[in-house]
């Protein structure tokens, strides 16, 4: 009972029930209409047949589909369900009495006025484009602008409320009962999104009569989520009339699938969320609407929310990075596929592996850090887009490097210092993802120290001089030695070597000019001297 491509939804009466089965294809977009049978008499057992609404978004690559209708025909979605089987004649006014009259049905007062959810996430709707080439969500859904269709099995019962008078003629051939004829009837609902109404079409029964009218003339302009009870159905070749109930589904354009994946988790997670737009839950019984979502190849991950439509996030975690997943997201109406979206989602780039750096043979003020080219493991890590190299002694400096370099000369270092180098690889996906930092360390070689600071000379006695100073800003080596050279008239007088800069020079000549030169030696190199001139006094004695 696959309908021809014609934007329709369908229902059937008194269907034979099959065991529940619902194969969800991987990487295929079906156009075969789904169908459901709901058995009457209180049973809610259902039968599924695969089906889908399919519209490829422009940024998606179409999936193979040998059954896709030609461009000339609209995509179809068929919904099949068996409506409830009324067994009693309604009292006059049946289910149609307004409040205050006999037979009134009380309207629940607790139904919220409007529980539609705001659409605040960018919808994966037609003509949208993926935010990032590394995490694209490709939605296939029926182009309901031209209509969608659904098929339901509707149970029938004897038309006890029928207005046809009983026949008094004895026929020589027994007519088939209308209950039997309409017991398996398929009703195709075609959605007209332009005016948001449905047309119902009773399939496989010629010249079906709804009451006194041709059914095809009256089963149109049906409001979504409406419920029509005790419709008298018959045709020329059956008697007596039987009744069916119709449950018109919500418009398929009321549902949209949204990508709710947090950017931070987009490499290992897929989050999808059905949202409703302009779906009036005062009218539409949310208990009739449910959803199923799962993604291949992760067979075990499935989100199911049955019996009530509470738009909530379905997040599948622990997925592989940079992997194509085919996700099947379905909205079920009374247990039947109303909307089925097949979405291709590629998880974001994975965390890259960082190669181990080598710190090389350092000089006093620079060293070469090098690392091997990363071996790409596409199943787990992504090829880096670049590197961040940091080096620190007390403070840290970092440098961003392109992904085509495998070495970097670190310059402007301080001599004779311990440095730690960290290298991390990163990728730019929805966010920048950094690999684990790998480290190496080194010690720069010694270099000439700076000059001593704050050199002072003083004359405690007529023929002695005190010399003091502070350490250099940078000693640049392992040891601390202060060297004092005393000169007079350009000639060497004496030399001192101490580990602190406090020199007492006595027994100098009276009334003589001296030159005092202090330098620092770090055990490897000697620095420049600082010079002070001082004269001894005449001998006061």
């Amino acid at each position: 009972q696959t309908p021809t491509p014609s934007d329709e939804l369908s229902t059937t009466e008194n269907a034979l029930l099959l065991p529940q089965s619902d194969p969800l294809p991987a990487r295929t977009t079906e156009s075969t209409p789904p169908s459901i049978s709901e058995r009457g008499n209180g049973s809610s057992e259902t039968t599924y047949h695969p089906g889908v609404l399919s519209t490829l978004l422009p940024h998606l690559s179409p999936q193979p589909d040998s059954q896709t209708p030609s461009a000339g025909g609209a995509d179809t979605q068929t919904f099949s369900s068996q409506a409830d089987n009324p067994t009693l004649t309604p009292a006059p006014g049946g289910g149609t009495d307004p409040p205050g009259v006999p037979g009134e049905r009380t309207v629940p007062g607790t139904i919220p006025a409007d529980t539609a959810f705001p659409v605040d996430t960018p919808s994966l709707a037609r003509n949208s484009s993926a935010a990032s080439p590394t995490h694209t969500s490709n939605v296939s859904t029926t182009d309901i602008s031209s209509g969608a269709s659904l098929t339901t099995l509707t149970p029938s019962t004897l038309g006890l409320a029928s207005t046809d008078p009983p026949s008094t003629t004895i026929a020589t051939t027994t007519k088939q009962t209308c209950a039997a004829m309409f017991g398996n009837i398929t009703v195709n609902y075609t959605y007209e999104s332009s005016n948001q109404t449905f047309k119902a079409d009773l399939k496989d029964v010629q010249n079906a009569k709804c009451g006194n009218e041709d059914c095809e003339n009256v089963l149109n302009n049906l409001e979504e989520c409406s419920q029509i009870k005790n419709i008298s159905v018959s045709n020329d070749s059956c008697a007596p009339a039987t009744t069916i109930d119709l449950y018109v589904p919500p418009g398929t354009d009321k549902f949209s699938l949204h990508d709710c994946t947090p950017k931070e988790k987009a490499n290992t997670s897929i989050c999808l969320e059905w949202k409703t737009k302009n779906l009036d839950f005062r009218k539409c019984n949310s208990d009739n609407i449910s959803y199923v979502l799962h993604c291949e190849p992760e067979n075990n991950t499935k989100c199911i929310r049955r019996n009530t439509f509470i738009p909530e996030r379905c997040q599948l975690d622990n997925l592989r990075a940079q992997t194509n997943y085919t996700c099947v997201a379905e909205i079920l109406y009374r247990g039947v596929k109303l909307v089925k979206n097949v979405i291709n989602v590629q998880t974001d780039l994975g965390i890259p592996e960082t190669p181990k750096p080598s710190c090389g043979d350092p000089a006093a003020r620079k060293t070469l850090v090098s690392w091997p080219e990363p071996v790409s493991k596409p199943e787990s890590a992504s090829k880096p887009h670049g590197y961040v190299l940091c080096y620190k002694n007390n403070s840290e400096k970092c440098k961003s490097l392109p992904n085509n370099v495998t070495s970097f000369e670190v310059e402007s270092l301080k001599p004779y210092k311990y440095y730690e180098v960290s290298l991390l690889a990163y990728v730019n996906g929805k966010i920048q993802r950094n690999g684990t930092a790998e480290k190496c360390n080194f010690h720069t070689k010694a270099d000439r120290p700076d000059k001593v600071n704050g050199m002072k000379t003083s004359r405690p006695t007529d023929n002695s001089i005190n010399v003091t100073c502070g350490p250099p800003y940078e000693t640049n080596g392992p040891k601390t030695f202060y060297i004092l050279v005393v000169r007079s008239g350009g000639s060497f007088v004496t030399k001192y070597n101490k580990t602190n800069c406090q020199f007492y020079v006595d027994n100098l000549y009276y009334s003589t000019d001296y030159e005092f030169l202090v330098s620092f030696h770090n055990g490897v190199y000697e620095g420049d001297s600082v010079i002070r001139n001082e004269s001894t006094n005449f001998n006061a004695k």
Epitope: T96, P98, G211, C215, S226, Q227, Y247, V248, F281, K283
Partner: nanobody
Framework: QVQLVESGGGLVHPGDSLRLSCAAS????????MGWYRQSPGSQRELVAT??????TYADSVKGRFTISRDNAKNIVYLQMNSLKPEDTAVYYC??????????????WGQGTQVTVSG
């Protein structure tokens, strides 16, 4: 919103016929039940006849005498009343009722048209 305007009421003799019309405008759907109710002084409003997707329902008191029909293209519901009796005298109200799968239903009423059957 749905607006309903009735017409066709009047004063007739017992046994005569009368045809009431109710024109609906606004958000009118074929899935809604349209019908006629009547109320005579001192009584409650009672069902006369309803129709939805071609299927009519009648009160026992009018079966065989009244016929309800609906022109979906024009959104008009008619009540053909034959063999009128004095007890059919009442104000006749047109009703539009949408019933939903949630159990919620919404009613709209016309202003009413007077039918008087007197000999």
């Amino acid at each position: 919103q749905v607006q309903l305007v009735e017409s066709g009421g009047g004063l007739v003799h017992p046994g005569d016929s009368l045809r009431l019309s109710c024109a609906a405008s606004g958000s009118v759907f074929n899935s809604a039940t349209m019908g006629w109710y009547r109320q005579s002084p001192g009584s409650q409003r009672e069902l006369v006849a309803t129709i939805v997707v071609g299927t009519p329902t009648y009160a026992d008191s009018v079966k065989g005498r009244f016929t309800i029909s609906r022109d979906n293209a024009k959104n008009i519901v008619y009540l053909q009343m034959n063999s009128l009796k004095p007890e059919d005298t009442a104000v006749y109200y047109c009703n539009y009722r949408a019933t939903y799968t949630s159990g919620y239903s919404r009613d709209y009423w016309g202003q009413g048209t007077q039918v008087t059957v007197s000999g």
